[in-house]
Structure formats: structure tokens, C-alpha cells
Interface confidence: medium
């Protein structure tokens, strides 16, 4: 009821709690001597539902029939209306529409570890829109029952506080949900289980590993677990890796050996426990353990290549490179490579350790049979040495590569293609594409890059270290026994038009033609391949088209002769430069008189 | 030191009601746990029902279920055994019993603390 209702009463038939659908008869009647003051027939009582008018009546007392009301609560008010004077609060009262609950379904109960407690959970059903009661029971082995109610409104879980013992873990427990409202209840239907049906154990703790002779090999993982369980999953992979070794083990007693792992590799491990082979349920995985596994000596061996550099009549420099082991191979932090130089006439050896690079550059005599070798050392041991003798890459003419090409092959890749060499291909032992930056100076600093390729193959993708819009020079070797061919082409992943064209630095004069030499466009302006450089030229304050002399380009040229001026006559002259995308823009201008007598 | 005194026993017709009580001390209502236990002469001590005063998870045994109620006030740290529809069969001497863990038991030995106990006669 609402407010104090001193001047009537509001009734609500048949009660205050009702079905969905169903109907209500309210009765708002006036007390004695609480009308109008004067005119007690002039009593004008209003039925309000929530703030709207639903009905009115002039007398004593006021009945109405109310259907259709909603789920949820519906607040009735009975007011007086007198002549002249406002509206009068009589009386009022709450009506509740809702549902008797449905059968509480998949009721289901677990005890997180042997020491917790039994908690059950279930699915109300759909909203009752009412006040509704459930009560939890369990009965269990000695006419023993425990029951336990939950006022919550929304009460689809409880816990019992009780802990369920081993004493006997084939005795048979029985749970039951009520839901109890005004309108009527409804009991799930019983869930029976053992104690090892319920029963969850706690993950697993204090996961320790241990390697018995820093040894890879010899590797245990220990635990600790509750007393009763009997079943244990592992489950490990490398930190890197999202797919999990699994293992399952009985009676583990919290220790397990494991035999596959790799050397040197962060692992994280993880483990469940299980009361019992086919009962129960599986813990949740225990909190992870990473650790890292011991070192093992080096396996494989290193991509050993070079490069021979004519210094003068008598002395050589050779460029070593190496590519890292892959982390199986080194199969352990590489603390430095062992290089080994050999003269292999004279027997003389020269070894020296490297730390911190991939490369090693010396100057050796021209003469001699030279041999290196080179190896990769970790904390446990060293690789197998890669030895190669050092001889002319390209001294073998009839072995060289024929009709290689140097295509786009999407973002960042060059497809490289060629033709055996005309020698009998079956000779060729493998092929190796190498390729740089091109750099106008030759410069020996720019790294080094190649791949190795099987003697049948004649095309290879290359990708690694590959820029857009850099002009690459990629060479190509056919490799068989002490001798190589080798053949070169310039290439690119991606390009187009030079930012700008070379700068003309002079122009001289030489026996009726001119020189001109030139400064090489920035390699970060080139774009590309240069293909070609063209030099235009026009009499200067001439309307006429120029004149142009394109020349192919090569990477070590810087200037060219021009004998088609005629003398004292000056000109005007500039350069572009073009790679397959198009052509550049200007260069500076230059003007020129050859001073020399007309022919 | 933990205390336990009941209290409510007395003599009463077949079909009547009496209510028990066991008020506790020294021991925080929170951890607290209590069991009815009953023993007639010549019989061994019974488990009748127990209650957790924090949680209010009740427990009877089949004989009483429905006929008895356990319940408890954790203000007052007191547990209540109502006891309706009596039978000659349930006079005994009622003891109250509490302990500090919840297990699954119809043992005794789990108790740790012990009233004085108070004698139910159901006679006409």
C-alpha cells in the first residue's frame, strides 16, 4: 500500500501478485466523513495508473476492471477531486505481473580443490519479474542434507561452505534447486555425483626444471600437486611459438623427464591435474614456468663467400662474408667465428678470431694457392669449418652465365634468369647469384649479399636487402671444381624517372671537339637503373629543337666527346638522364664557344 | 576460550514444539559452525543438523528433516534448533557442538568445542 491511506482504502482482487494475462478488480472506497467537504455527491474519485487517468467516478466509491498489464510493477492511485480545490491523494497501491519460475536447468556443482568448497550453479530460466526464492540442496551418504536459500534477484549460483571429503569417493551426493515465488515453483531435476565427479583439483605449483649436466638431454620438471591426484597433462613450446607440446602422465608423483627439447631455446611449461582416468575434471593449468635450455655445440656449418680485389702488380685483398647460423644451428649465443687463412703450398696458416661481424678483409700476394676456412664457436663447442680455396670467380670464360636478365617481381624482389654456360652445362656444381648496392665509386663497404642455387635451377628470386627505386648490380656465377664464369647485370625491384640529371662540372676543348665530363646523379636521386645519359645542346637564343647524343650507361664513365659543334658558335648545354620509367628533368645549363677554325 | 551453553530443553507432549538454543563465545561468528547432536540412553551420540552461522547453509538428517529447523543470528553469535511435531523417539539429552571448518561429515570427532548439553523429554 502507498502513503497512509487515512481518508480511504484502495483493494486489489484477487491479490496484489498476479499471472501474466490475468485480470484485477481495484476498489478505491472513501472512509467515513473524508469526502468533499459539503457536498458529498459532488465526490469525484479518479483512478490514476502511474501519472495517467484511468477511470473516475462520482460517489463514495470507485471500481475498476484492469487488464493487460505489463511484466514488472504497476503503481495504482486513488485520488479525490472537490470543487475548487486541487486533487487530494486518497490511497494507492503496487500490483506485481509476473511469471511462476521455470524449471531450473543444468544444475551443476564443483569443489575447487580437496580443501574447498562445494559450489553449484544452474539457469534460472526466463525472468519471473518477481520476488523469487531458491534453495540449493544436497544429500549426501548417511542420511546427511545440506540445504541453503539465495534471496538474490538474480540468483543462479551458491556456495554451500562445505567441504566435501575423500573419506569416500565413490559415495553418491544428490543436488537439487528449488524457485519458489507467489505464483507457483518448480524443482530442477537432481544431479548425482561422487565426490571425484565434483571434485577440481588446484592447478599445480612451485614448477621448477632442472638440466643434469647443463645437458639439453637430460631434463626434468618437477611439481607440486594435492595428495589425491593421479593424472598430470604437461603441456610446453618454444616462447615464440603458439603451438603447445602436449604429454599426459599417471602417477607422476610431481616429477616428469622430458626428451625433446631444444638446446638454447626460452620454453614455457604448463601443467593440469586430474583425480581420476575417466571422473572429474581437469584443474586449470597452473601458472607458466619459462626457462631457457642449456647450450649445445653448433650443428651445420656456415654460407661462407668472397670477393678478390686487384690491389697492384703483387698484392690481393680478399673479402670474407658469412651468413649467421640459423638458431637451430648455432644452438647457443655464437661468441665468435674462427677464421683460418692457408697458404696451401707453403702450409702457412693464419688464424684469428672474430667477434661481432659477418665479414673479415686481408691482403694477400697474388701468387700462392690460398685456402680459408671458417667456423662458428658458442659457449659449448664450434661448427664444422666451411673451407673454400680462393681463386679467379670470373677467370673461366666459357663457364660464365649466359643471357642473364634482371626482372621486377613484385614489391622488393628481382627475378633473376639465365642460361647455362655454353661449356658443358653438366660440368656447372651450383650457381651463385650475388648482389650490391650500385655505387659509382665501387666502393668496397657496401655489404654483400647472395644466395646459393642448385646446378639445374637457372632462375632465382632475390628479396633479402632489397630496396625500391636502388639500382642493384646482381652477378651471377657458375661454380664447377677450382674454376668459376661468372656474368653481371644491373637490376632493380621498383622505379621510375631520376629526380634530377647530372651536373655538367667542365667542358674542354680538344682538337676540334669538345669534353664534356659530368658529376653522377645521387644514388638516392636515380631511381633506379640509369640506362642511358643524353646530352642536348642548341645554339643559344635559337628557337630550334637541340640536338642530342644519348650514350648508354656505364657505371664508371663521367665524361664524353661531342664533335658536331661548329666554332664560334656558342652553345647551350645540359643533361638527363633516363631509367626505364622515363626521363629526368634538366641539369644545369652550360654555354661553350669552340674556339678551333671552322672546317 | 571458546564457550558453549544451551539452553530450552524440558519436558513436552507428542506433537509439540520446544526451541533450543546455543549461544557461543570466544570464537568470531564469521568461522564459525554449529551442529546439534543428540544421544539417548544406551545409544551412541547422533548428528541432528548443524548450520554455518555466516553462510546459513543448513544439514539435517533424515529423521528430522521437516519437522526440525536450524537457524542462527550472527550478531548475537547464537544458533537455534526449532524443534515441531515431536516424537517420543526424540527425547534425548541435546548437545551443541561448533567448529571452525565445514566439511561434509556426520562425525562427532569433527567438532572441537562441546556444550554442557539439555535434556528434551517427549512424553504424555
Known amino acids: 500500500k502507498i502513503d497512509a491511506c487515512k481518508r480511504g482504502d484502495v483493494t486489489v482482487k484477487p491479490s496484489h501478485v498476479i499471472l501474466l494475462g490475468s485480470t484485477v478488480n481495484i476498489t478505491c472506497s472513501l472512509k467515513p466523513r473524508q469526502g468533499c467537504f459539503h457536498y458529498s455527491r459532488r465526490n469525484k474519485l479518479i483512478l490514476y495508473k502511474f501519472d495517467r487517468r484511468i477511470n473516475f467516478h462520482h460517489g463514495h466509491s470507485l471500481n475498476s476492471q484492469v487488464t493487460g498489464l505489463p511484466l514488472g510493477t504497476t503503481l495504482f492511485v486513488c485520488k479525490l477531486a472537490c470543487i475548487n480545490s486541487d486533487e487530494i491523494q486518497i490511497c494507492g497501491a503496487e500490483i506485481f505481473v509476473g511469471v511462476a519460475p521455470e524449471q531450473p536447468q543444468n544444475l551443476s556443482c564443483i569443489q575447487k580443490g580437496e580443501q574447498g568448497t562445494v559450489a553449484c550453479t544452474w539457469e534460472r530460466g526466463r525472468d519471473t519479474h518477481l520476488y523469487t526464492e531458491y534453495t540449493l540442496q544436497l544429500s549426501g551418504p548417511k542420511n546427511l542434507t545440506w540445504q541453503k536459500q539465495c534471496k538474490d534477484i538474480y540468483c543462479d549460483y551458491l556456495d554451500f561452505g562445505i567441504n566435501l571429503t575423500p573419506e569416500s569417493p565413490e559415495s553418491n551426493f544428490t543436488a537439487k534447486v528449488t524457485a519458489v515465488n507467489s505464483l507457483g515453483s518448480s524443482s530442477s531435476l537432481p544431479s548425482t555425483f561422487t565426490f571425484l565427479d565434483i571434485v577440481r583439483p588446484l592447478p599445480p605449483w612451485d614448477i621448477r626444471i632442472k638440466f643434469q649436466k647443463a645437458s639439453v638431454s637430460r631434463c626434468t620438471l618437477y611439481w607440486r600437486d594435492e595428495g589425491l591426484v593421479l593424472l598430470n597433462r604437461l603441456r610446453y613450446r618454444p616462447s615464440n611459438s603458439r603451438l603447445w607440446n602436449m604429454v599426459n602422465v599417471t602417477k607422476a608423483k610431481g616429477r616428469h623427464d622430458l626428451l625433446d627439447l631444444k638446446p638454447f631455446t626460452e620454453y614455457e611449461f604448463q601443467i593440469s591435474s586430474k583425480l581420476h582416468l575417466y571422473k572429474g575434471s581437469w584443474s586449470d593449468w597452473s601458472e607458466s614456468l619459462r626457462a631457457q635450455t642449456p647450450e649445445e655445440e653448433p650443428t651445420g656449418m656456415l654460407d661462407v663467400w668472397y670477393m678478390k680485389r686487384h690491389i697492384d702488380y703483387s698484392r690481393q685483398q680478399i673479402s670474407l662474408f658469412w651468413k649467421n647460423l640459423s638458431v637451430s644451428e648455432a644452438r647457443g649465443k655464437i661468441l665468435h667465428y674462427q677464421v683460418t687463412l692457408q697458404e696451401l703450398t707453403g702450409g702457412k696458416a693464419m688464424t684469428q678470431n672474430i667477434t661481432g661481424h659477418t665479414s673479415w678483409t686481408t691482403v694477400i700476394p697474388r701468387t700462392g694457392n690460398w685456402a680459408v676456412a671458417v667456423s662458428a664457436a658458442n659457449s659449448k663447442g664450434s661448427s664444422l669449418p666451411t673451407r673454400i680455396n680462393i681463386m679467379n670467380l670470373c677467370e673461366a670464360g666459357l663457364l660464365a652465365p649466359r643471357q642473364v636478365s634482371a626482372n621486377s617481381e613484385g614489391m622488393d624482389n628481382i627475378l633473376v634468369t639465365w642460361q647455362p654456360p655454353r661449356k658443358d652445362p653438366s660440368a656447372v656444381q651450383e650457381y651463385v647469384v650475388e648482389w650490391r648496392e650500385l655505387h659509382p665509386g665501387g666502393d668496397t663497404q657496401v655489404p654483400l649479399n647472395w644466395l646459393r642455387s642448385r646446378p639445374y635451377n637457372v632462375s632465382a628470386l632475390i628479396s633479402e636487402n632489397i630496396k625500391s627505386y636502388i639500382c642493384y648490380e646482381i652477378r651471377v656465377y657458375a661454380l664447377s671444381g677450382d674454376q668459376g664464369g661468372c656474368s653481371s647485370i644491373l637490376g632493380n625491384s621498383k622505379h621510375k624517372a631520376p629526380l634530377s640529371g647530372p651536373h655538367i662540372n667542365a667542358i674542354t676543348e680538344e682538337k676540334g671537339s669538345i669534353l664534356i665530363s659530368w658529376n653522377s646523379i645521387p644514388v638516392q636521386e636515380q631511381m633506379g637503373c640509369l640506362l642511358h645519359y643524353r646530352i642536348y645542346w642548341k645554339e643559344r637564343d635559337s628557337n630550334s629543337q637541340p640536338q642530342l647524343c644519348e650514350i648508354p650507361y656505364r657505371v664508371s664513365q663521367n665524361s664524353h666527346p661531342i664533335n658536331s659543334l661548329q666554332p664560334r658558335v656558342t652553345y647551350v648545354l645540359w643533361m638527363t638522364a633516363l631509367t626505364a620509367a622515363g626521363e629526368s628533368s634538366h641539369g644545369n645549363e652550360r654555354e661553350f664557344c669552340l674556339q678551333g677554325k671552322a672546317n | 576460550q571458546v564457550q558453549l551453553q544451551e539452553s530450552g530443553g524440558g519436558l513436552v507432549q507428542p506433537g509439540g514444539s520446544l526451541r533450543l538454543s546455543c549461544a557461543a563465545s570466544?570464537?568470531?561468528?564469521?568461522?564459525?559452525?554449529v551442529g546439534w547432536f543428540r544421544q539417548s540412553p544406551g545409544k551412541e551420540r547422533e548428528f541432528v543438523a548443524a548450520?554455518?552461522?555466516?553462510?546459513?547453509?543448513?544439514a539435517y538428517t533424515d529423521s528430522v528433516k521437516g519437522r526440525f529447523t536450524i537457524s542462527g543470528d550472527n550478531v548475537k553469535n547464537t544458533a537455534y534448533l526449532q524443534m515441531n511435531s515431536l516424537r517420543p523417539e526424540d527425547t534425548a539429552v541435546y548437545y551443541c557442538?561448533?567448529?571452525?571448518?565445514?566439511?561434509?561429515?556426520?562425525?562427532?570427532?569433527?567438532?572441537?568445542?562441546w556444550g554442557q548439553g539439555t535434556q528434551v523429554t517427549v512424553s504424555s
Open positions: 557442538a561448533a567448529r571452525e571448518r565445514f566439511i561434509w561429515t556426520w562425525s562427532d570427532l569433527t567438532y572441537d568445542y
Open positions: 570466544g570464537i568470531s561468528s564469521s568461522r564459525l559452525h
Open positions: 548450520i554455518s552461522l555466516s553462510g546459513g547453509t543448513q
